[in-house]
């Protein structure tokens, strides 16, 4: 049985203190520039080396930021969200959603040396080949009618 990639979503409150160069990360998203399809949320796109966020270590690229100092980031233009961060105080409280990729395999014990799942291309290539063969056979059959 093949492994299946799922996501474990967890939330965390991260309190950051502005360093000499600020909070030290970039964001994407907003109602005017959706980063994720059908989601106007705000996501971390880059964490700057040696910035406050990098030194704290909890905020990760790809994390979704739900609120800043208790203020919801839903339905904000990108620039309004940026403003909210820039004009926040010295101590900034972030409510963050992490998406952890987890491998869901068959029920039962998986040995330490076992692979954690089959790469997707190893499944797709045979499926694609079979589809092509079936299509070819169907076309030949139609020609004979």
């Amino acid at each position: 049985m093949n492994g299946r990639v799922d996501y474990l979503v967890t939330e965390e409150e991260i309190n950051l203190t502005r360093g000499p160069s600020g909070l030290g990360f970039n964001i994407v998203g907003g109602t005017d520039q959706q980063y994720v399809s059908n989601d106007s949320g705000i996501y971390v796109s880059r964490i700057k080396e040696n910035g406050a966020a990098a030194l704290d270590g909890r905020l990760q690229e790809g994390d979704k930021i739900l609120s800043v100092n208790g203020q919801d980031l839903k339905n904000l233009l990108h620039q309004d969200a940026v403003d909210l961060f820039r004009n926040a105080g010295y101590a900034v409280s972030l409510r963050v959603q992490h998406r952890l990729q987890v491998q869901n395999g068959p029920i039962g014990h998986r040995g330490e040396g076992d692979p954690s799942g089959i790469p997707i291309f190893m499944v797709l290539v045979p499926v694609f080949a079979l589809t092509m063969v079936a299509a070819w056979a169907f076309m030949r059959y139609r020609q004979q009618l």
Epitope: N26, V28, V82, R86
Partner: nanobody, 120 residues
Framework: QVQLVESGGGLVQAGGSLRLSCQAS????????MAWFRQAPGKEREFVAA????????YYADSVKGRFTISRDNAKNTVYLQMNNLKPEDTAVYYC??????????????WGQGTQVTVS
């Protein structure tokens, strides 16, 4: 590189007024958001006011609402902070900050050296 130069600070009596100016120079500056922050002795730097265009937005800290007014002259790349009804607790070094208009950083990109405001 962008340089920010503040001016207009000084000593003023409580209830008085001051007008701070901050001029941005440097070929890379593109009329992005600009702001004023302040830092009182022994305290952390705090946000005072910010202004941006496209779309136009103006923000104030609760402690200065109704007393301070931020404005800008895009042709001169200058932002102003008109401070009225000053109080002793407004005493601080006032810093100007600016960001490039397309920056996605959650921090201001440039900072001035600061100008001292003392309210007696």
């Amino acid at each position: 590189q962008v340089q920010l130069v503040e001016s207009g600070g000084g000593l003023v009596q409580a209830g008085g007024s001051l007008r701070l100016s901050c001029q941005a120079s440097g070929r890379t500056f593109d009329s992005g958001p600009m702001a004023w922050f302040r830092q009182a002795p022994g305290k952390e730097r705090e946000f005072v006011a910010a202004i941006r265009r496209s779309p136009e937005r103006i923000y104030y800290a609760d402690s200065v609402k109704g007393r301070f007014t931020i404005s800008r002259d895009n042709a001169k790349n200058t932002v102003y902070l008109q401070m009225n009804n000053l109080k002793p607790e407004d005493t601080a070094v006032y810093y100007c900050a600016a960001a490039l208009s397309r920056s996605t950083s959650v921090d201001y990109d440039y900072w001035g050296q600061g100008t001292q405001v003392t309210v007696s």
